[in-house]
């Protein structure tokens, strides 16, 4: 005959309050000839859970009916489970005995732990944006989980990402935790479109992790390249000059013409493009009179991209004779 | 094969003893507690007593108590009762039954039984 | 001790006929009640255990119903190898007690 072996599958199981919970429990062999009993803790305090001979256990049913004859199956369902329930759940075989039965072999137990899924997590950017090849910070928070073991993961892009420092809180005991992480994360041009991604697993998720996302198109500052150019043709007596503000974010711009150091007001054709890498470009058109101009006309185009210093270009403007010539036919 | 194979018939004068044996075979004998069961003549069932064949271990009805002894010897897989101080309401069919039932007592395997009689 | 009280004492019936037997503890058992069948110089048989489980090898015309201190033996279609004595046993606690018997008996 087999020895007898308890056999308690599970090391930890997490339940949540107000649900119910099975408790597992099999058996190798039905000799010696004796009761099954379930109980909470060791020694002499330990609490009866379960006798299917006497007793009350109302919120205690079996899984199968220990009425049978061979049945080797001992598992319960505790129902409406609340914070009083936790603890380490043994079933024990008796041999029967007398004047009372003898304990014969518990299982290794099974401890019931109350587990608390984490909240979806929260990732947060820095408040200001910083230009390319700067580092920021982000961070990942999640709460409301338990037990204490948690795994965080941060990924760029999907590329995991290994600068960065985690907290669970509290370290002792308690009802519930608490995680927060700050990764730091270098800036590079093309990330505009780029994501954060903090990703939390914890054994209440079972194999599913939560997911934070933050986009660093919030965190990023691209600063603009300027070019002016004079247009070689001219339409009539006016001469294009185009400033083409190239790889810029945010869209947040303001462009100003100056003509010799004077505000030009007037309006200017322009157009907006986005880049494939979600930077933008701005293209603005001035057209100079160039009737009556002195050789010494210098454009600026000034740019003021959110909210940073101004940056400009000048162009000085080259007006040959001949042009002048024509314009003057060209005038009345 | 699963069997309670008992010993024979015997007659007893009052105040005698008897030994009756119950051999088990075909079950692992450790395993399973034995009763004792007997049966006067044209009379119901009434339980003598139990033994654990695991640890020998005993609970005799309160009426035999003191006259009364069961015994196993695991070696050899055998279950004894003996019977002190025979009164001729001792006369009875004797059974040896095993007991099966893991939280309670239910008797699924039963030798033939062997009758006693007191007689002067 | 738990008196166990069967009845009837006796029951004469024909073969095809539905038997009750009864049987009553004096104190709540729970479902540990055995019933059994013994034929005239041979060993007693285990029917039904645990109230309404059915031994091994036994015919499904036996079954067993009752928990607390109310327990009932039906015999739904009376075969002639069925007339016999049958006791109810409790199997609660020390000391294990049988019921007097009920004698089925051919009409």
């Known amino acids: 005959e087999e020895e007898l072996q308890m056999i308690q599958p599970e090391k930890l199981l997490l339940v949540t309050v107000g649900k119910t919970a099975t408790l597992h429990c099999t058996v190798t062999s039905l000799l010696p000839v004796g009761p099954v009993l379930w109980f909470r803790g060791v020694g002499p305090g330990r609490e009866l859970i379960y006798n299917q001979k006497e007793g009350h256990f109302p919120r205690v049913t079996t899984v199968s009916d220990l009425t049978k004859r061979n049945n080797m199956d001992f598992s319960i369902r505790i129902s409406s489970i609340t914070p009083a329930d936790v603890g380490t759940y043994y079933c024990v075989k008796f041999r029967k005995g007398s004047p009372e039965n003898v304990e014969f072999k518990s299982g290794p137990g099974t401890e019931m732990a109350l587990g608390a899924k984490p909240s979806a997590p929260v990732v947060l950017g820095p408040a200001a944006r910083t230009t390319p090849e700067h580092t920021v910070s982000f961070t990942c928070e999640s709460h409301g989980f338990s037990p204490r073991d948690i795994t965080l993961k941060w990924f760029k892009n999907g590329n995991e990402l290994s600068d960065f420092q985690t907290n669970v809180d509290p370290t002792g005991q308690s009802v519930a935790y608490s995680i927060r992480s700050t990764a730091r994360v270098v800036l590079d041009p093309w990330d505009v479109r780029s994501q954060v991604i903090c990703e939390v697993a914890h054994v209440t998720l079972q194999g599913d992790p939560l997911r934070g996302t933050a986009n660093l198109s919030e965190a990023i500052r691209v600063p603009p390249t300027l070019e002016v150019t004079q247009q070689p043709m001219r339409v009539g007596n006016q001469v294009n000059v185009t400033c083409q503000v190239r790889k810029f974010y945010p869209q947040s711009l303001q462009l100003t013409w100056s003509e010799n150091g004077n505000v030009c007001q007037r309006e200017t054709a322009s157009t907006l493009t986005e880049n494939k890498d979600g930077t933008y470009n701005w293209t603005s058109w001035f057209l100079v009179n160039i009737s009556d101009q002195r050789d010494d006309v210098v454009l600026t185009c000034q740019v003021k991209h959110d909210g940073q210093l101004a940056v400009s270009k000048r162009l000085a403007l080259e007006v040959t004779v001949h042009q002048k010539d024509q314009s003057s036919d060209a005038t009345p | 094969q699963v069997q309670l194979v008992q010993s024979g018939a015997e007659v007893k004068k009052p105040g005698a003893s008897v030994k009756v044996s119950c051999k088990a075979s075909g079950y692992t004998f450790t395993g399973y507690g034995i009763v004792w069961v007997r049966q006067a003549p044209g009379q119901g069932l009434e339980w003598m007593g139990w033994i654990s064949a695991y640890a020998g271990e005993t609970n005799y009805a309160q009426k035999l108590q003191g006259r009364v002894t069961m015994t196993t010897d695991t070696s050899t897989s055998t279950a004894y009762m003996e019977l002190r101080s025979l009164r001729s309401d001792d006369t009875a069919v004797y059974y040896c039954a095993r007991e099966a039932g893991s939280s309670w007592y239910d008797f699924d395997l039963w030798g033939r039984g062997t009758l006693v009689t007191v007689s002067s | 001790d738990i008196q166990m009280t069967q009845s009837p004492s006796s029951v004469s019936a024909s073969v095809g006929d539905r038997v009750t037997i009864t049987c009553r503890a004096s104190?709540?058992?729970?479902?540990?009640l055995a019933w059994y069948q013994q034929k005239p110089g041979k060993a007693p048989k285990l029917l039904i255990y645990?109230?309404?489980n059915l031994q091994s090898g036994v015919p499904s015309r036996f079954s067993g119903s009752g928990s607390g201190t109310d327990f009932t033996l039906t015999i739904s279609s009376l075969q002639p190898e069925d007339f016999a004595t049958y006791y109810c046993?409790?199997?609660?606690?020390?000391?294990?007690?049988f019921g007097g018997g009920t004698k089925v008996e051919i009409k």
């Open positions: 046993q409790q199997g609660a606690s020390f000391p294990i007690t």
């Open positions: 645990a109230a309404s």
């Open positions: 104190q709540g058992i729970s479902s540990w």
